[in-house]
Interface confidence: low
Amino acid sequence: CGTSECCFQDPPYSDADSGSASGPRDLSCYRISSAGYECSWQYEGPTAGVSHFLRCCLSSGRCCYFATGSATRLQFSDQAGVSVLHTVTLWVESWARNRTEKSPEVTLQLYKSVKYKPPLGDIKVSKLAGQLRMEWETPDNQVGAEVQFRHRTPSSSWKLGDCGPQDDDTESCLCPLEMNVAQEFQLRRRRLGSQGSSWSKWSSPVCVPPENPPQPQVRFSVEQLGRDGRRRLTLKEQPTQLELPEGCQGPAPGVEVTYQLQLHMLSCPCKAKATRTLPLEKMPYLSGAAYNVAVISSNRFGPGPNQTWHIPADTHTEPVALNISVGTNGTTMYWPARAQSTTYCIEWQPVGQEGSLATCNLTAPQDPDPAGMATYSWSRESGAMGQEKCYHITIFASAHPKKLTLWSTVLSTYHFGGNASAAGTPHHVSVKNHSLDSVSVDWAPSLLSTCPGVLKEYVVRCRDEDSNQVSEHPVQPTETQVTLSDLRAGVAYTVQVRADTAWLRGAWSQPQRFSIKVQVSD
């Protein structure tokens, strides 16, 4: 027999199948051109000294063989003696070491057995009712296919699944979606309705993330507020990387988890933008305001669970930066200005009500005045800081108020609102004899003392009613007692106390009359 034709004789070996586990398998035959055909197969086991014979039986019952030697692939034409228009049965017999091993048979019409391509190009992946939907363009001239998929996770081996018959210009497959692990999928196709025809190769891997992106396990730290009024937010611990199946390691698209940082500035609620989202790599500078920081993990199916942290406000206060002048028309604050065209946010909140929303006001962009100061004024009618209580004031600045990460803290301080002069007047002034020429004056702390840094000092005034001589005694803001010495017995005195702030002289308390009794010797 010639080498290019199927030999209608008995093969040159005994045809008993040894039934071993090794041998030829996965035979597939298909048309490769208008008149050309190819069969190929796998051989399991040692290949030394193995001779392969492709066997073919026609529908008439006549059988022939091609001897391929050690090759596991054979090409032949429609002139090789094998009927290509009618059903034939093909198998491989491999002869080695006086044994013959036989592959499973395939029965097909060679002319109709076209080698199908796997899904090519872009395989679109989406989520549909808790399942995974894959969709792709049907390869040219190959409408009508059976499709299979196989999938694996990082810890499991391949599992086979069926996509069902396809008969359109686009093909699709519903596959299982894992909640918490990434998967690798591959797809293959074969001609619809020809069970004996061969499967295409497997497609390139399709890498699919878990339905839920992993919870971002990260930790933050925030630096001290710098002299520029900003502090750096730093990432202490990177998010853990998702474990990937073998074919998805390396630059496999589709399984990426992106982490984004969502900043919510809780302070200064009247500003234009409260929330800003940044890539996690872009660790921002923050003002001294309070923030909520969320890390959002997203994959191709959208955002997943997020983790939120609260960054408390930096409450370090500046004792001297703010000047406040109270006039008949209202109140004006002055502080060292930032650059040209800066917007300021002035926020105030009664001390002890930190849980509630602060009140604030956004200034128009302003330039420094000739003295290098910025100002904010309000009238008494506005009601701003109008109650006689302690307020915490924070001033933030930005040349770009809409960009959340460009705010900085100018100062943080306290202010006593309303008529601080009157409200701060010390009460319960009492005088006690101390010695023959001195008395001890005590008073209840001023309301101003509840406001850190506001009370500059107490002043105690003593007037000699006989001579009208007045002496004033400054007292530290932490003290509520003073001793008046060098007093004369029998003289009437009045004593008053006032509480002063850095910008305001307090109102005197009610005069308290006293005298030191003249000591009569026995």
């Epitope: 959208g302 770009h400 809409k402």
Partner: antibody
Framework: QVQLVESGGGVVQPGRSLRLSCAAS????????MSWVRQAPGKGLEWVAG????????EYADSVKGRFTISRDNSKNTLYLQMNSLRAEDTAVYYC??????????????WGRGTLVTVSS | AIQMTQSPSSLSASVGDRVTITCRAS??????LAWYQQKPGKAPKLLIY???SLQSGVPSRFSGSGSGTDFTLTISSLQPEDFATYYC?????????FGQGTKVEIK
Amino acid sequence: QVQLVESGGGVVQPGRSLRLSCAASGFTFTSYGMSWVRQAPGKGLEWVAGISYDASDTEYADSVKGRFTISRDNSKNTLYLQMNSLRAEDTAVYYCARSPDYIIDYGFDYWGRGTLVTVSS
Amino acid sequence: AIQMTQSPSSLSASVGDRVTITCRASQGISSDLAWYQQKPGKAPKLLIYDASSLQSGVPSRFSGSGSGTDFTLTISSLQPEDFATYYCQQYWWYPFTFGQGTKVEIK
């Protein structure tokens, strides 16, 4: 690849309504702010409205405030523009455009091909 | 609303020329400015964002500069495919506004 496909345009009489849609694909729609920008025939570009990734923030041009409503359906990857009380000066090609961030404080990195709205009696 | 004024409104140039288009904002907008290219019948294409950052995929012959109120788009060596209309856009404050456009034509 990122694709934005507008639909819903057509000829409409003054005073009537029209709803434009923009179908988004090729990116995680839920992670981006979106806007509508229009261009009257032979004229320049005009920003119409914008919406943040989660619809918590919507903004409008003064010329359409109170008449147009921007919205999104993240489950359908679709952006909408509901246009009521249409006027002749609303005649334009309407483009759907993506912001490169969750919010809309930025330029627009991807645009659709546009859909023509003609308001005429 | 912030007004954006582009100049010139049109210009004629030859392949290889250096072309400069300016955009002025009616108030300071920091660097919140984008430049777009639009060809007839097509959607605009982002070239520059944040006044000077080149959008990925855009040739390096395009560059942007400026901050505050005055901005410039420069094409270092004009190519045949660069003949189009160019727009600037501010995104500093709502409503976002575009310049009226600069048409770059073949000389």
